[in-house]
Amino acid sequence: TGADTEAVVCAGTACYTAHWGKLSAAEAQNLCLQNGGNLATVKSEEEAQHVQQVLAQLLRREAALTARMGKFWIGLQREKGKCLDPSLPLKGFSWVGGGEDTPYSNWHKELRNSCISKRCVSLLLDLSQPLLPGRLPKWSEGPCGSPGSPGSNIEGFVCKFSFKGMCRPLALGGPGQVTYTTPFQTTSSSLEAVPFASAANVACGEGDKDDSQSHYFLCKEKAPDVFDWGSSGPLCVSPKYGCNFNNGGCHQDCFEGGDGSFLCGCRPGFRLLDDLVTCASRNPCSSSPCRGGATCIPGPHGKNYTCRCPQGYQLDSSQLDCVDVDECQDSPCAQECVNTPGSFRCECWVGYEPGGPGEGACQDVDECALGRSPCAQGCTNTEGSFHCSCEEGYVLAGEDGTQCQDVDECVGPGGPLCDSLCFNTQGSFRCGCLPGWVLAPNGVSCAMGPVSLGPPSGPPDEEYKGEREGSTVPPAATASPTRGPEGTPKSTPTTRRPLLSSDAPITSVPLEVLAPSGSPGLWREPSIHHTTAASGAQEPAGGDSSVATQNDDGTDGQK
């Protein structure tokens, strides 16, 4: 990338240089960095045109254009581990020098979907064709290359150097040559704008004569945002030419004096600046240079201007337009931040509400608070949520898990709880016996009793009636098969002692459904579940112990 093939374009507040070189993206970026720049950004169509201009310069310097495609690195890259994001204009890529993502893009084709590898972007050029202003180079993404292996068709790179301001090119009022040396070590004689801190070497004269004089100037910031050379009057003036050479070096009007001297002047509405060459608008804001809601503020002495944005907006890279500030980048909220035009708002996650110390803070909503509990029975508040629980004998139900449903212990997975008949109740169950049998004191077994016809018998008295234990059942859990039936004293949790009290749902039974005397028989009452007889139950002589069971498919079957 020698100086003999330098190409440079300066515009706005930046200069672009284009270079030949089969280098990796990292090597190219290092070369740009060495001179205080970065691989170029292409954040707008205007910037794309500047980059195209500098590439056109570079291609003109190539003696013979070859019929091939060539790629030139720009500063758009996606780091390892950052995935392609089709929802964004830059597809998850970002500019190496930093700065905001912009809506402009010019992708060549659909991008390769990847996350693992670092990916870099180059401008794709047909090196056999002259660059046309209407056809801006397309962006091509691919591997970033490595030293000695830059990647396929990589021919060079474009750097960008940003400055606080620019000086106008020096205008000569007579024959001479200006050579600019920029802070990024480029020399040029044809810059449309010259960056701050550049040096200008002016050699006056025809060049082949000995009457040449040399002048040396520096582009300085004369006042805030006012940049000029500190020269006064046109350079290399010659009475021989007067206003006829390059308009005397004047920006607008040139007035000749009778003695061969001349002066520069300005048109109505403009005034002559301190360099006695350049004209500036009396009101620099008269041309409405600021856009996007920005306010134009004239600079001192009617020179230059600055654009100012309303609160919540900031100037973009052109310093003329306002773009929304994404306040959410600074994480001002405790939980969720929503950026809005000119502002932002904080939101809380489900289960939280605004409140607590600090701006944008969120506090847990106590869903279990008095009067707002969504649960039918137990409610436990948790951070950002809650969960419902049920008393023993119930399980969580309902599509949102807030209701409690009675567990039918008589069909529980733990096997039979009663030796003969089982009656489900709200939150519990009771045992009973078939005609001719009575419930044993343990409330579970059946013992042979006086023969009688009628409904199944319950326990002999109320002595076992006790409180049901109030421990909760975890969500989706089933009732423990070891839990005793209603009426079991707490002191004997291992013994199942069901109770059939006077309010038990028993209906009288027609004689024809009863089994022959002396047999436990089959009790077919829809609300009653039959279980296998316990081994301890007495069996009448000569009688079969025929017991009803419930099959897995929910139908009754006889064992």
């Epitope: 089709p86 390769r112 979907n113 693992i116 590898s117 591997p143």
Partner: antibody, heavy 120, light 108 residues
Framework: QVQLQQSGADLVRPGASVKLSCKAS????????MHWVKQTPVYGLEWIGG????????AYNQNFKGKATLTADKSSSAAYMELRSLTSEDSAVYYC?????????????WGQGTSVTVSS | ENVLTQSPAIMSASPGEKVTMTCRAS???????LHWYQQKSGASPKLWIY???NLAFGVPARFSGSGSGTSYSLTISSVEAEDAATYYC?????????FGSGTKLEIK
């Protein structure tokens, strides 16, 4: 259509190494990354790492660095995972997977899995 | 690493019921990078919902997904027998990719 065909089940001795293969078909092999996932009853699904066949670049879960090495062979359109210094903890089903044309690491295609049993 | 916690671990539902399972992340996840997989016994996982709410090809419309930040959920509006499976959430917010421990859905 995209298919990922994995090598058969392996029974290996503790301390040994094993190399699992995943042959891709139905697409251009270098277009999609290939990732590997381990499944055990205790730890469920664990991402081991991935490889970009175009560049050979890899990304690993720190928990598997030194245990797994990922490679890809463009000529045979196959991805490989070598597991070394095997212990009973490495007994698992291993899947190769990729996200095809979907974005954001949504794994759209999965191999049938290779069961590795480490036992003496 | 970003740990995903799924709840409940096991759930049971009758056909026609609506069910919701949740996935909580230990740190925020972009909704684009949160996905759900269905796995049936002896089979490979299948992508079921991608980028929080997009149904993968062939997934019935009774499935839906929602969420943002650290809290995400998968809902089945009316469960069918064929939905019995284990559902895993998965996220990417920088390496490593992580999966949830799964929610096993049983049909009564």
């Amino acid at each position: 259509q995209v298919q990922l065909q994995q090598s058969g089940a392996d029974l290996v001795r503790p301390g040994a190494s094993v190399k699992l293969s995943c042959k891709a078909s139905g697409y251009t092999f270098t277009d999609y990354e290939m990732h590997w996932v381990k499944q055990t009853p205790v730890y469920g699904l664990e991402w081991i790492g991935g490889i970009d066949p175009e560049t050979g670049d890899t990304a690993y879960n720190q928990n598997f660095k030194g245990k797994a090495t990922l490679t890809a062979d463009k000529s045979s359109s196959a991805a490989y995972m070598e597991l070394r210094s095997l212990t009973s903890e490495d007994s698992a089903v291993y899947y190769c997977t990729n996200y095809g044309n979907l974005y954001y690491y949504a794994m759209d295609y999965w191999g049938q899995g290779t069961s590795v049993t480490v036992s003496s | 690493e970003n740990v995903l916690t799924q709840s409940p671990a096991i759930m049971s539902a009758s056909p026609g019921e609506k069910v919701t399972m949740t996935c909580r992340a230990s740190s925020s996840v972009s909704s684009s990078y949160l996905h759900w997989y269905q796995q049936k016994s002896g089979a490979s996982p299948k992508l079921w919902i991608y980028s929080t709410s997009n149904l993968a090809f062939g997934v019935p419309a009774r499935f839906s997904g929602s969420g943002s930040g650290t809290s995400y959920s998968l809902t089945i509006s009316s469960v069918e027998a064929e939905d019995a499976a284990t559902y895993y959430c998965q996220q990417y917010s920088g390496y490593p990719l992580t999966f949830g421990s799964g929610t096993k859905l049983e049909i009564k």
